[in-house]
Structure formats: structure tokens, C-alpha cells
């Protein structure tokens, strides 16, 4: 806590400029007016402050606005958003995506923090849900981030967002995660024809039944074996050999080298010795 | 976790010039900014010269404007301190403090802080 004492003559900041740089902490302290420094917090984030100078005007941020600070103020805080705590941000209320996009960039290059996690969180149960646009911010930033959700916080995905997501943001997404995106992606691409269909689908297919794997394998869609292995086992189980046969198209080839591992063994055990040597790749039931 | 460590100081008359060196353990490309903050006796630290990294703009303090120059030389991870015409209220221990553009490692997520060196000592004497 810095101590309280009187401004020196003709020290009084009348803007946020460079030779605060300069300046002792009890003289940032003293000298710059915490309503000055609201209205000129764009200009803090040009200026090389120590993060020892940053908490003194944190501290004079916090004590002019004890509820939180409002939005104008956290759209341009720059560099001192590393300083908030999760406490902190919870007070606040952001609803502009332009101050979640300002902030998100501070943080670009690095894994969520902490405080990045409060702030997405306040941003989204503000908005009620992920929209389109929130999401597009959201996984140009952190490409995980969809997969870091809940099913449940997944469930508040309007289908229409499921345009902005991309192979990659899904990587990390588990069976259940992708349970509850797959019908949301389903209803997204319904429109488009079957080989443009299957490229927006493929990688939510870890949440797809049976019987939309069986339609698939009417389509001539040439599942490659990566896609294959993600399926969920018990929707793979009751495909028949021709099915997937279908299904993987000249990738059927690859069968043999995943034929210990899920879901191709389990698959494996449930058909007809008979069926399986129709492929000829030497698999045993 | 970075460390810098300062070199350079000494017993030096009047008028005369010292060059002071900050190594950093790791890349200075980390930092935000560099910081050379002196400590006279009896008072407190003050910063003398800052280096914006990012914008590669140099800032002086009033006292030393037109005497000391800053500089970093990437290749090394080092910060220098050229200072010229001294005076006896240079008399100080001088630090090197820099700023990191974000926690030092992933998933850090204490207090952001600023890296300090353990100061070098330069007294002005005739």
C-alpha cells in the first residue's frame, strides 16, 4: 500500500503522458487523479510502466470505482488487465465484444489464465449464449476453447455458431462433447450436398449414431481411418463389413494396421469370420 | 524464472564515465520494457531510463537527460547503462528492472511482477 502524502509543487499530472514514467509510486500515488486516469486509460498501455507502477494505478482505479469498473474503462486496459484478479473481474459487466477482443489480445499467444477464463465466462452469461460471432472471437484466440466447455455450456450453442468452428478446435473435445455438438452440426449443414456435407461434418462424427453412419456409407464419402478411430464404438458395432466397406472407400486398407485398437477390434469381434475375409486383409474375429 | 545480474559500477571522480551492464539468464525478447532504477542512500528508488522494447523508444529521466544513454543488444540479452559527465548525486545503487510481457511460464498465474537485479554501486568522488 503506497502512503498517502501530499502532491509536490507542479508535480500534479494534467495528462497520462510519458514522464509518469518517472515518477515514485507514492507520487503516482499523490499526483495522478484517478478520474484522469479513467478517462485517459488508452494512453497507459503506450506508456513502459513497471508492473510496480501499475499496481499503484490499479489501487487508484479500484478506489474510484469499488463496484467494478465500467465497460469504457476495462475496453482499454491493455496490460493492466494482467494485473486483475478473477475477484475483479467478476465485478465487472462487459457486454462489447471489441473489449473482449481488446483484452483476449493482451493475452494472445498464451494459454488461458485464470482471469481470461472470468472474463469469457462473464462475457458469455451476459450475452445468455454463444453466439456466432462470440464464438468466432472466442476460437481464433484459443482454439481449445470449445472443448474446455461443459456439456452443459455446450447445450447453449445456437446451431448457427457452429459455422465458425474449425477441424482444429475440436482436437480436444471428448465422446461427450462432441454428443451434444454433432446434432447441432447435423442441423447446421443440412442443406448442402453429400461431398460438401461430409467435410463439414467429419469432424464432429465422434458424436454421430448408427444410423447416420450408415447413411454416410451410401455416399460414396471415403471416411479416412483418423475420422474412423474417433467414431463412438457402440455406433460402429452394428455396421456391417459391407457398410464399412463403403464407408472408408480405399481406406478399408487401413484396418488392419488399428485391428487392436478401439473401436476396430470391438468392431472386429462382433462380425463373421466369413464377412471380414470378403476384405481380404487378414482380419480375424 | 529470469535473473538479471548487473556489472559495471565502481569509484569513479566527477565529470568522468561509467558503462553499466544487466545480463538476463533468458531472452530479453520476454520483456515488455527494461528499467535502470538507482537508489541513493537514505532515499528512495527511482528510475533513471526505460526502454520500451516493443516500440524500441528510449525515455530519460530530467536529472540524467543529455548525460546517460540506454541501450540493449539483443544478441547478448544484455541492457547497458552509458553514463557520462557524472556527478556526485549519482552516488547510488543502480538496478536493472525489467517487465515481462506475460507470466514467465505456462500456466503461471500468480502475481505478474516485475524481474529486479541485485544492483551494482557507483559512487562519484573526487
Known amino acids: 500500500e503506497v502512503e498517502k502524502t501530499a502532491c509536490p509543487s507542479g508535480k500534479k499530472a494534467r495528462e497520462i503522458d510519458e514522464s509518469l514514467i518517472f515518477y515514485k509510486k507514492w507520487e503516482l500515488e499523490a499526483c495522478v487523479d484517478a478520474a484522469l486516469l479513467a478517462t485517459q486509460m488508452d494512453r497507459v498501455n503506450a506508456i513502459p510502466f513497471t508492473y510496480e507502477q501499475l499496481d499503484v494505478l490499479k489501487h487508484k482505479l479500484d478506489e474510484l470505482y469499488p463496484q467494478g469498473y465500467p465497460e469504457s474503462v476495462i475496453q482499454h486496459l491493455g496490460y493492466l488487465f494482467l494485473k486483475m484478479s478473477p475477484e475483479d473481474i467478476r465485478k465487472w459487466n462487459v457486454t462489447s465484444l471489441e473489449t473482449l477482443k481488446a483484452l483476449l489480445e493482451v493475452n494472445k499467444g498464451h494459454e488461458m489464465s485464470p482471469q481470461v477464463a472470468t472474463l469469457i465466462d462473464r462475457f458469455v452469461k451476459g450475452r445468455g449464449q454463444l453466439d456466432k460471432d462470440t464464438l468466432d472471437t472466442l476460437t481464433a484466440f484459443y482454439p481449445g476453447y470449445l472443448c474446455s466447455l461443459s456439456p452443459e455450456e455446450l447445450s447453449s450453442v445456437p446451431p448457427s455458431s457452429i459455422w465458425a468452428v474449425r477441424p482444429q478446435d475440436l482436437d480436444t473435445c471428448d465422446p461427450r462433447q462432441l454428443d451434444v455438438l454433432y446434432p447441432k452440426a447435423r442441423l447446421a449443414f443440412q442443406n448442402m450436398n453429400g461431398s460438401e456435407y461430409f467435410v463439414k461434418i467429419q469432424s464432429f462424427l465422434g458424436g454421430a449414431p448408427t444410423e447416420d453412419l450408415k447413411a454416410l456409407s451410401q455416399q460414396n464419402v471415403s471416411m479416412d481411418l483418423a475420422t474412423f478411430m474417433k467414431l463412438r464404438t457402440d455406433a460402429v458395432l452394428p455396421l456391417t463389413v459391407a457398410e464399412v466397406q463403403k464407408l472408408l472407400g480405399p481406406h478399408v486398407e487401413g484396418l488392419k494396421a488399428e485391428e487392436r485398437h478401439r473401436p476396430v477390434r470391438d468392431w472386429i469381434l462382433r462380425q463373421r469370420q466369413d464377412d471380414l475375409d470378403t476384405l481380404g486383409l487378414g482380419l480375424q474375429g | 524464472q529470469v535473473q538479471l545480474v548487473e556489472s559495471g559500477g565502481g569509484v569513479v571522480q566527477p565529470g568522468r564515465s561509467l558503462r553499466l551492464s544487466c545480463a538476463a539468464s533468458g531472452s530479453i525478447s520476454k520483456f515488455r520494457s527494461m528499467h535502470w532504477v538507482r537508489q541513493a542512500p537514505g532515499k528512495e528508488r527511482e528510475s533513471v531510463a526505460t526502454?520500451?522494447?516493443?516500440?524500441?523508444?528510449?525515455y530519460y529521466a530530467d536529472s540524467v537527460k543529455g548525460r546517460f544513454t540506454i541501450s540493449r543488444d539483443n544478441s547478448k540479452n544484455t541492457l547497458y547503462l552509458q553514463m557520462n559527465s557524472l556527478r556526485a548525486e549519482d552516488t547510488a545503487v543502480y538496478y536493472c528492472?525489467?517487465?515481462?510481457?506475460?507470466?514467465?511460464?505456462?500456466?503461471?498465474?500468480?502475481?505478474?511482477?516485475?524481474?529486479w537485479g541485485q544492483g551494482t554501486l557507483v559512487t562519484v568522488s573526487s
Open positions: 526502454i520500451d522494447l516493443g516500440a524500441n523508444t528510449y
Open positions: 528492472a525489467a517487465a515481462p510481457k506475460w507470466y514467465s511460464d505456462p500456466g503461471q498465474s500468480d502475481d505478474l511482477h516485475d524481474y
